[in-house]
């Protein structure tokens, strides 16, 4: 039975040209996290595998940085980065947990960042 829950940064906004941290946290389970995939719609952004470390998809290498923790940092944001992002936690023995973050990239310099979420 899957008892865990994913907490995320939720809906967030950021300014064009800036950067943002996407973070998820899996709680309420003792399952072992074997891998976390970060995806944007149907595109794989990055993988953090517990055995191997981080791999950033080649098309995002210039603008995506690993971490902090299992999170992902998006840099040099453009309006085209607006959309849904998913953290997919592969765990044993529970299986897969998915969290959703909606990022809006604004032209304005008055973009309000969502509440910063910190992994304890």
């Amino acid at each position: 039975m899957m008892t865990g829950t994913i907490e995320t940064t939720g809906n967030i906004s950021a300014e064009k040209g800036g950067s943002i941290i996407l973070q998820c946290h899996l709680s309420s389970t003792t399952a072992q996290v074997t891998q976390v995939n970060w995806e944007q719609q149907d595109q794989l952004l990055a993988i953090c595998n517990a055995d191997l470390g981080w791999h950033i998809s080649p098309s995002f290498k210039d603008r995506v940085a690993p971490g902090p923790g299992l999170g992902l940092t998006l840099q040099s944001l453009t309006v085209n980065d607006t959309g849904e992002y998913f953290c997919i936690y592969h765990t044993y023995p529970d299986g897969t947990y998915t969290g959703r973050i909606f990022l809006e990239v604004l032209e304005s310099s008055v973009a309000e960042h969502g509440a910063r979420f910190q992994i304890p």
């Epitope: 074997t34 891998q35 595998n49 055995d51 191997l52 470390g53 971490g67």
Partner: antibody, heavy 120, light 107 residues
Framework: EVQLLESGGGLVQPGGSLRLSCAAS????????MSWVRQAPGKGLEWVSS????????YYADSVKGRFTISRDNSKNTLYLQMNSLRAEDTAVYYC?????????????WGQGTLVTVSS | DIQMTQSPSSLSASVGDRVTITCRAS??????LNWYQQKPGKAPKLLIY???RLQSGVPSRFSGSGSGTDFTLTISSLQPEDFATYYC?????????FGGGTKVEIK
């Protein structure tokens, strides 16, 4: 005692194929990621590929992507590297190495290496 | 990709000398930096992982420091068995790049 023993190297013509093996002992093989690292004669070290403990996740260097395939057989405690479409620049000593996931993904144990020579 | 620049590429030193090798990453890699020693005809050996942690069985005369982009490997008192080539490597993200190496030779 952790031991890694590579085999399968040799002389092959450009465009040819070769399969390297790495026999592991002294640790729970399926609990560790594994990597191949190569060293051209008189040159430095170059990471080639990595595979997770379960074998479900693989990473490759751009220079070998689409030509080399890493795999493992945990029932035989053996790591493999299938090398196709070999080029002169693939000439190197190939080392298998264990990935220490709990130690910042360093390569904590290495085999003695096997020499691959690509020449006509 | 992250570039790792090691310096010097070679150095001459005497037994008992303090030796320092530096490694610079082209972008911040936190503490995901490892150091290896390689002797001619042999496989590399892990000395330091996570920038400053000594691998089990490695003599305490070896130490590592740094974070972000700049890292240092120090041998406090060079011993005859320390003459070798030393490599840094980032394990921050693929392709897990190695530095070009530093050859430590006998003066």
């Amino acid at each position: 005692e952790v031991q890694l023993l590579e085999s399968g190297g040799g002389l092959v013509q450009p465009g040819g194929s070769l399969r390297l093996s790495c026999a592991a002992s002294g640790f729970t093989f399926g609990s560790y990621g594994m990597s191949w690292v190569r060293q051209a004669p008189g040159k430095g070290l170059e990471w080639v590929s990595s595979i997770s403990g379960s074998g479900s996740t693989t990473y490759y260097a751009d220079s070998v992507k689409g030509r080399f395939t890493i795999s493992r057989d945990n029932s035989k405690n053996t790591l493999y590297l299938q090398m196709n479409s070999l080029r002169a620049e693939d000439t190197a000593v190939y080392y298998c190495a264990r990935v220490a996931g709990s130690s910042g993904w360093a390569f904590d144990y290495w085999g003695q290496g096997t020499l691959v020579t690509v020449s006509s | 990709d992250i570039q790792m620049t090691q310096s010097p590429s070679s150095l001459s030193a005497s037994v008992g000398d303090r030796v320092t090798i530096t490694c610079r990453a082209s972008q911040a890699i936190s503490n995901y930096l490892n150091w290896y020693q390689q002797k001619p005809g042999k496989a590399p050996k892990l000395l330091i992982y996570a920038a400053s942690r000594l691998q089990s069985g490695v003599p305490s005369r070896f130490s590592g420091s740094g974070s972000g982009t700049d890292f240092t490997l120090t041998i406090s008192s060079l011993q005859p068995e320390d003459f070798a080539t030393y490599y840094c490597q980032e394990s921050y993200s693929t392709p897990f790049t190695f530095g070009g190496g530093t050859k430590v030779e006998i003066k």
